[in-house]
């Protein structure tokens, strides 16, 4: 904690301005009134404070708002946002997208993924759902940030908003997030024609179940290997060699390169070597010819 001292009369602060950059840490602590700071937060970012001085200003705001800052202060944090921890941000209630934009701009180029994720979470909570305006703001100012949201938060996305999501916005999404987003995307794009539907649904396919992947294999979609590799392992394993061949179309040629990587490796292990050989790609590791496959899972379920 900054040592408490009395403010010398000549150092008394009546407004937040450039002169404060010459104040030592303990002078700032003693002379800046927290309420004045909060009222004039819009001036702070224009003043080239050192990181040490910003620490003092943050400390003042923390004392004034132990339950979390009001949005009027949050909106004008500027570079002071870089001093915030996820724990600080968790106390906030943010509803304005202007606030979100301002802070996303400040965080660019800094290692603040945890803080940004918490901020976005607070915005979604504050606004009640992940609406189109919020998604548009995220895709414009923070590509990939959508995937920082928990599956629970993503469940508040209405299907009508899914169209605003671009493929690159989903690059960092994990399986659990895609599990939530895929059914919404399927609903959002259900009235599109075959090829147009596939282009739209492709980034979400990491959440698709086996039956949907099988259905795609009947539609001449020519799925690229990058998309195939992002499919859920559980969705790929039940596919037959013929189904994978039809699903990938001209991209089937790339299977050999991915032979050692999941889910291709796991899929190969489930196929008869004879069937794999029909592809003519040299895929190895299938069930040897003449071996019997016993499905013990049924017996286990009954025991």
């Amino acid at each position: 904690d900054v040592e408490r001292t009395t403010c010398p009369p000549e150092k008394e602060v009546h407004e937040i301005d450039e002169s404060l950059i010459f104040y030592k840490k303990r002078e700032l602590e003693a002379c800046v009134d927290a309420a004045l700071l909060a009222a004039q937060m819009d001036r702070v970012d224009a003043i080239p404070f050192t990181y040490e001085q910003l620490d003092v200003l943050k400390h003042k705001l923390d004392e004034l708002y132990p339950q979390g800052y009001p949005e009027s202060v949050i909106r004008h944090l500027g570079h002071l946002f870089l001093k915030m921890s996820p724990e600080d941000i968790r106390k906030w209630n943010v509803t304005s997208l202007e606030t979100l934009k301002a802070l996303l701009k400040v965080s660019k180029g800094h290692e603040m993924s945890a803080q940004v994720a918490t901020l976005i979470d607070r915005v979604v909570v504050g606004r009640g759902q992940l609406d189109k305006d919020t998604v548009d703001t995220l895709t414009a100012f923070c590509p990939g940030c959508l995937c920082s949201l928990s599956p629970e938060r993503l469940s508040s996305v209405p299907p009508s908003v899914i169209g605003a999501v671009r493929p690159q916005d989903l690059d960092t999404c994990g399986p659990r997030q895609l599990d939530v987003l895929y059914p919404k995307a399927r609903l959002a794009f259900q009235n599109m024609s075959g090829s147009e539907y596939f282009v739209k649904i492709r980034p979400f396919l990491g959440g698709a179940p086996t039956e949907d992947v099988k259905a795609l294999s009947q539609q001449n979609v020519s799925m690229d290997l990058a998309t195939f590799m992002k499919l859920r392992r559980e969705a790929v394993l039940p596919l037959t060699v013929a189904e994978v061949q039809k699903l990938l179309g001209p991209h089937v040629e790339g299977l050999k390169v991915e032979e050692q990587h999941s889910p291709v490796r796991d899929w190969i292990l489930k196929q008869r070597q004879d069937d794999l050989d029909t592809l003519g790609l040299g895929l190895q590791g299938g069930i040897p010819n003449g071996y019997l496959i016993l499905d013990l899972s049924v017996r286990e379920a009954l025991s």
């Epitope: 001449n220 020519s222 690229d224 179309g249 001209p250 991209h251 089937v252 040629e253 790339g254 050999k256 070597q273 794999l276 050989d277 029909t278 592809l279 003519g280 790609l281 040299g282 895929l283 190895q284």
Partner: antibody
Framework: EVQLVESGGGLVQPGESLRLSCAAT????????MHWVRQGPGKGLVWVSR????????VYADSVKGRFTISRDNAKNTLFLQMNSLRAEDTAVYYC?????????WGQGTLVTVSS | DIQMTQSPSSLSASVGDRVTITCRAS??????LTWYQRKPEKAPKSLIY???SLQSGVPSRFSGSGSGTDFTLTISSLQPEDFATYYC?????????FGQGAKLEIK
């Protein structure tokens, strides 16, 4: 290391026969489709024939259908092209190649010259 | 049979240049197209498959685009080792057919 080595080329007269071989090493031969492709003097690449992994399915270019036969011996890791009723226009370097629709490995070729 | 027509049949360029070779199919082949690079006395090497997917180990300066009947191979910044003959080939249906080749020479 994958290697494909063609042999059996040479000079023959029109109407005669020739059998080309392609010895494969460095990979599981029986799991791959194989092709023959040729290139005539001063000409481009022309696909000739394809055989599937176990030899049960073959396809030919119209220009060689009924005259050429592709076959394989998976036990000996060898691909063959039996060429009958040879014509002057069959003169070319013949390459064996590994792959499905795309040929990812090629041999260095064997020259077949049909001339009287 | 599906005819494949490449253009230009020859072109000269300098190191660092951006080069584009086109290939046209006589009927719709979707994305069933590959591009090969062939150097004298060497076996052809597949660069691109499925019209736009880069084969493993091929430098990223090579890219392919197109679908249906019109396709393009682009080399973004020519390197000395890129001077060769380039062939397109369709694998949509038999007989497999190649373009006549495009010879890329040093200017």
């Amino acid at each position: 290391e994958v290697q494909l080595v063609e042999s059996g080329g040479g000079l023959v007269q029109p109407g005669e026969s020739l059998r080309l071989s392609c010895a494969a090493t460095g990979f599981t031969f029986s799991s791959y489709w194989m092709h023959w492709v040729r290139q005539g003097p001063g000409k481009g690449l022309v696909w000739v024939s394809r055989i599937n992994s176990d030899g049960t399915s073959t396809v030919y270019a119209d220009s060689v259908k009924g005259r050429f036969t592709i076959s394989r011996d998976n036990a000996k890791n060898t691909l063959f092209l039996q060429m009958n009723s040879l014509r002057a226009e069959d003169t070319a370097v013949y390459y064996c190649a590994r792959g499905r629709g795309i040929m990812t490995y090629w041999g260095q070729g064997t020259l077949v010259t049909v001339s009287s | 049979d599906i005819q494949m027509t490449q253009s230009p049949s020859s072109l000269s360029a300098s190191v660092g240049d951006r080069v584009t070779i086109t290939c046209r199919a006589s009927q719709d082949i979707g994305s069933w197209l590959t591009w090969y690079q062939r150097k004298p006395e060497k076996a052809p090497k597949s660069l691109i498959y499925a019209a736009s997917s880069l084969q493993s180990g091929v430098p990223s300066r090579f890219s392919g685009s197109g679908s249906g009947t019109d396709f393009t191979l682009t080399i973004s910044s020519l390197q000395p080792e890129d001077f060769a003959t380039y062939y397109c080939q369709q694998y949509k249906s038999y007989p497999l057919t190649f373009g006549q080749g495009a010879k890329l020479e040093i200017k």
